[in-house]
């Protein structure tokens, strides 16, 4: 896939550094595990934002109103926080794509088998729409073999 980061898109990199993509990862993992109905206990639970206002004064409140409907009690909090984060990429579709690629990459180790990987990818593609945001066109979510530092 094309490596925009090598072209020096510093503004996007800054956005990605400040974003907290964990709620998105947690929401999606919960969703596919719920759909599979094969996990007894969900290991994810609401947690402190690693970039919470107390640690980073310039961070916005992750619980501010968001433009989508709440669905599914278990991960609605994660979804709301996730949508707040993705909303920051609304005006930069290439950066939105990179955020989605980052979520995919972060979770790739955890996905068990091709089927779960495809399901995660499907849910990830739908995520911007679920948040009432535009989905980026032509966003490659394939994770190449070779690990996280292949760049």
């Amino acid at each position: 896939r094309q490596q925009w980061e090598l072209q020096g898109d510093r503004r996007c990199q800054s956005q990605l550094e400040r974003a907290n993509l964990r709620p998105c990862e947690q929401h999606l993992m919960q969703k596919i595990q719920r759909d599979e109905d094969s996990y007894g206990r969900d290991p994810y639970s609401p947690s402190q934002d690693p970039y919470s206002p107390s640690q980073d004064p310039d961070r916005r409140d992750p619980y501010s109103p968001s433009p989508y409907d709440r669905r599914g009690a278990g991960s609605s909090q994660h979804q709301e926080r996730c949508c707040n984060e993705l909303n920051e990429f609304e005006n930069n579709q290439r950066c939105m794509c990179e955020a989605l690629q980052q979520i995919m990459e972060n979770q790739s180790d955890r996905l068990q088998g091709r089927q779960q990987e495809q399901q995660f990818k499907r849910e990830l593609r739908n995520l911007p729409q679920q948040c009432g945001l535009r989905a980026p066109q032509r966003c490659d979510l394939e994770v190449e073999s070779g690990g996280r530092d292949r760049y």
């Epitope: 980061e5 090598l6 550094e17 947690s47 402190q48 690693p50 990459e105 972060n106 180790d109 530092d149």
Partner: antibody, heavy 121, light 103 residues
């Protein structure tokens, strides 16, 4: 992936020292980097982290105001400027790479071999 | 809080180390191995996910505040100090370490 620390040595209490960590084998500018220290015979202590752009920095309370983390992406090097050094800062200082690009939110997947800082009169 | 601080076991034994967090860290916990005189090495991330190339005799489990690290079939090359580390928030904190020796 290779991380090589340098700049350690003997310094008097109240003195200053600048540690460097030069990286190779990965796209340095998109990964967060950290410093972790280990007093001789003791456990590991996280000291500081910096994001790829250098815009986000974090410090453990005991070094705030005394240590400054910075990076030069053109030289693929991260620095730790240490001032007002105390005896309790004596330790091996390791630099470590974030496992995941962009964010300071995941574990360290590669570490350097460390450089010894001794603060003594 | 990591315990025990040290342990001695025989080759082939099963060794268990625990790590207790002071607050809920979901599964944002890693385990590192530090062989004397060497840099730490990441073995497990996200509480239970083994890093590529790490032998399957190492395993981790837990979520919330209670975590366990296990070595099944202890080998002489496993002599090291093992550390847990939370990365849920800053400051990132390490457990006190567990020194594993062969008796």
């Amino acid at each position: 992936v290779q991380l090589v620390e340098s700049g350690g040595g003997l310094v008097q209490p109240g003195g200053s020292l600048r540690l460097s960590c030069t990286a190779s084998g990965f796209t340095f500018s998109i990964f967060g980097m950290s410093w972790v220290r280990q007093a001789p015979g003791k456990g590991l202590e996280w000291v500081s982290s910096i994001s790829g752009t250098g815009e986000i920095t974090k410090y453990t309370d005991s070094v705030k105001g005394r240590f400054t983390i910075s990076r030069d992406n053109s030289k693929t090097t991260v620095y730790l400027q240490m001032k007002s050094l105390r005896a309790e800062d004596t330790a091996f200082y390791f630099c470590a790479k974030e496992r995941t690009k962009y964010q300071l939110a995941y574990p360290f997947d590669y570490w350097g071999q460390g450089t010894l800082v001794t603060v003594s009169s | 809080t990591q315990s025990p601080s040290s342990l001695s076991a025989s080759v082939g034994d099963r060794v268990t180390i625990t790590c207790q967090a002071s607050q809920d860290i979901t599964t944002y916990l890693s385990w590192y191995q530090q062989i004397p005189g060497k840099a730490p090495k990441l073995l497990i991330s996200d509480a239970s996910f083994l890093q590529a190339g790490v032998p399957s005799r190492f395993s981790g489990s837990g979520s919330g505040t209670d975590f366990t690290f296990t070595i099944t079939n202890l080998q002489p090359e496993d002599v090291a100090t093992y550390y847990c580390q939370q990365y849920e928030n800053f400051p990132r904190t390490f457990g006190g370490g567990t020194k594993v020796e062969i008796r």
